[in-house]
């Protein structure tokens, strides 16, 4: 009778084991072990027992002891069970960002590991078990579906293998995959709201505001604002689940025309975009052209109003005929035209919006000098010793210099309060002089003597 010890062994992969083969007869013809494993016989006294060291045990094996005794041949098997933890425990790669409400499939793959009967695969969220299944197949695969929730944000998902050899007197061997950190997000289906000027004048600044609410986590949202190829640098303010991005946009002559303004919000692996057109225009103030800004009385003056080729102008409130960017009027300069304003108003329609500009020029009319009865009376009669103010106003542009002299030497104090004396009586020659010429006028002062009764 052949016997083997131990009859059952659990050992780590690549390990060694001592197996004793024994026989019940004293003088066996033959006693040995049959195994593909490397073996080394340890020398022992006696003929009915042999000890073998079996090494580099890589897989389950059933070495067989045999003996040949006079009463016949017999065999005995020992059962070697190899254990080893999996070589690979991995969660199938997933995008780290997942939208809330999506069904997320977690897939764990386990390569290797034995004995499989003692190997379990566990899927976890943090420390919470989601699914536990025995490892089946090579590689073993365990899947579970998770409905992504907002509160899953930042949660770690992992896969753990448990090789439980406690019933065999060994321990529980655990292997854990690298964690998958879930980033959950909510990006609403509504595009961001974009508020900006529809039209913008070159060399000016405009303000663009892009906003969106219903976002989670709002701090992770990326906002891209651009006008054409010009990337804008917004200041972003965040609310609980909203943001508002405000940017200044400066435009130059090179930007003229219709430009695309875009606001893109990127969160997770999704984006929402809003497009708007902004028309960049150039509209210099209209020009008021006077043939000469300063003319003499009686001169013919042409006033021209010229604006942007697509503008419509009015000159002093009168529309151009035909409707367009140019208007003009002709006038013969009179003293009343001195200081007259000529206003050119231009309206430019840009993308349906009306833009208004104007410019005003003043005409200077040179005239005079003038001395007339109304402003410089020819006769004054004043009582002696009364207080009087001689008045004589010369008109003209430029304002004439006025002198009133009696006998070429004695001046009349124009505009000053004087006490009337006999010396004041007489005829004065008032002379008004300017660059435009000279006029004279005789003024007579009569002094009434008081009557003595």
């Amino acid at each position: 009778q052949t016997s083997v010890s131990p009859s059952k062994v659990i050992l780590p992969r690549g390990g060694s084991v001592l197996v004793t083969c024994s026989t019940s007869c004293d003088q066996p013809k033959l006693l040995g072990i049959e195994t593909p494993l490397p073996k080394k016989e340890l020398l022992l006294p006696g003929n009915n027992r042999k000890v073998y060291e079996l090494s580099n045990v890589q897989e389950d094996s059933q070495p067989m002891c045999y003996s040949n005794c006079p009463d016949g041949q017999s065999t005995a098997k020992t059962f070697l069970t190899v254990y080893w933890t999996p070589e690979r425990v991995e969660l199938a790669p997933l995008p780290s960002w997942q939208p809330v409400g999506k069904n997320l499939t977690l897939r764990c793959q386990v390569e290797g590991g034995a004995p499989r009967a003692n190997l379990t695969v566990v899927l976890l969220r943090g420390e919470k078990e989601l699914k536990r299944e025995p490892a089946v197949g090579e590689p073993a695969e365990v899947t579970t579906t998770v409905l992504v929730r907002r509160d899953h944000h930042g949660a770690n998902f992992s896969c753990r293998t448990e090789l439980d050899l406690r019933p065999q007197g060994l321990e529980l061997f655990e292997n854990t995959s690298a964690p998958y950190q879930l980033q959950t997000f909510v990006l609403p289906a509504t595009p961001p709201q974009l508020v900006s000027p529809r039209v913008l004048e070159v060399d000016t600044q405009g303000t663009v505001v892009c906003s969106l609410d219903g976002l989670f986590p709002v701090s992770e949202a990326q906002v891209h604002l651009a006008l054409g190829d010009q990337r804008l640098n917004p200041t972003v303010t965040y609310g609980n689940d909203s943001f508002s991005a405000k940017a200044s946009v400066s435009v130059t002559a090179e930007d003229e025309g219709t430009q695309r303004l875009t606001c893109a919000v990127i969160l997770g692996n999704q984006s929402q975009e809003t497009l708007q057109t902004v028309t960049i225009y150039s509209f210099p103030a209209p020009n008021v052209i006077l043939t000469k800004p300063e003319v003499s009385e009686g001169t013919e003056v042409t006033v021209k109003c010229e604006a942007h080729p697509r503008a419509k102008v009015t000159l002093n409130g009168v529309p151009a005929q035909p409707l367009g960017p140019r208007a003009q009027l002709l006038l013969k300069a009179t003293p009343e035209d001195n200081g007259r304003s000529f206003s050119c108003s231009a309206t430019l329609e840009v993308a349906g919006q009306l833009i208004h500009k104007n410019q005003t020029r003043e005409l200077r009319v040179l005239y005079g000098p003038r001395l007339d009865e109304r402003d410089c009376p020819g006769n004054w009669t004043w009582p002696e010793n009364s207080q009087q103010t001689p008045m004589c106003q010369a008109w003209g542009n430029p304002l004439p210099e006025l002198k009133c002299l009696k006998d070429g030497t004695f001046p009349l104090p124009i505009g000053e309060s004087v006490t009337v004396t006999r010396d004041l009586e007489g005829t004065y020659l008032c002379r008004a002089r300017s660059t435009q010429g000279e006029v004279t006028r005789k003024v007579t002062v009569n002094v009434l003597s008081p009557r003595y009764e």
Epitope: R198, V199, R310, K312, V313, T314, L315, N316, G317, V318, P319, P322, L323, S343, C344, S345, T347, E349, A351, G352, Q353, L354, H356, N358
Partner: antibody, heavy 122, light 110 residues
Framework: QSVEESGGRLVTPGTPLTLTCTVS????????MSWVRQAPGKGLEWIGI?????STYYASWAKGRFTISKTSTTVDLSITSPTTEDTATYFC???????????????????WGPGTLVTVSA | AYDMTQTPASVEVAVGGTVTIKCQAS??????LSWFHQKPGQPPKRLIY???TLASGVSSRFKGSGSGTQFTLTISGVESADAATYYC????????????FGGGTEVVVK
């Protein structure tokens, strides 16, 4: 000075229709013209405008559904593919004025036609 | 876009009374605002332009005021003939996608 719409009639959904606005007493080369519609029992709804030079602008809901064009004395409104929601009275209005104080032009519907009724029904 | 908000949607007034209709623009339109009224089966008729200027042939009982974004139409000494729907209209822009008219105010005269 007057404007008058014509071409309104009963059409089946999807049948293209063109309305015409005929002007007299002023030149279309000096004015912008707008089309406005009014569904039964509803308010005034601006459809679009054509400028003195022929540029056109449309309300967002009207883009692609309507086309405005003009000749020297008429302004046309084409309804590409009418639906029952397009049942309304369609008005043509002169939409351009100027302020003699500032000298600026502005949009103002100072002259209206009597309107033409379009009924879209299967 | 220039949105025009008109209030109230409907108002009842006794003959001889006063009625006030407000129109608010979402952005400044300076003084480029007109008021119209419309009676059933008729085209709109312009009452006021440039916010406060009375159109020719319109009774001085109609008064327009305001500038920028807030405008008011006041009808004093209301007559039965004033029963109509009143609309404001901005004259600042006809850009693509623009709103031109307010929603309208129905004036019912008792």
């Amino acid at each position: 000075q007057s404007v008058e719409e014509s071409g309104g009639r009963l059409v089946t959904p999807g049948t293209p229709l063109t309305l015409t606005c005929t002007v007299s007493g002023f030149s279309l080369s000096n004015y912008y013209m707008s089309w406005v519609r009014q569904a039964p029992g509803k308010g005034l709804e601006w459809i679009g405008i054509i400028s003195d030079s022929g540029s056109t602008y449309y309300a967002s809901w009207a883009k692609g559904r309507f086309t405005i064009s003009k000749t020297s004395t008429t302004v046309d409104l084409s309804i590409t593919s009418p639906t029952t929601e397009d049942t309304a009275t369609y008005f043509c209005a002169r939409d351009w004025s100027y302020d003699s104080t500032s000298g600026y032009y502005y949009y103002d519907m100072d002259l209206w036609g009597p309107g033409t009724l379009v009924t879209v029904s299967a | 876009a220039y949105d025009m908000t008109q209030t109230p949607a409907s108002v009842e007034v006794a003959v001889g009374g006063t009625v006030t209709i407000k129109c608010q623009a979402s952005q400044s339109i300076n003084s480029w605002l007109s008021w119209f009224h419309q009676k059933p089966g008729q085209p709109p008729k312009r009452l006021i332009y440039k916010a406060s200027t009375l159109a020719s042939g319109v009774s001085s009982r109609f008064k327009g005021s305001g500038s920028g974004t807030q405008f008011t139409l006041t009808i004093s000494g209301v007559e039965s003939a004033d029963a109509a729907t009143y609309y404001c209209q901005q004259g600042y822009s006809r850009s693509d996608g623009e709103h031109v008219f307010g929603g309208g105010t129905e004036v019912v005269v008792k």
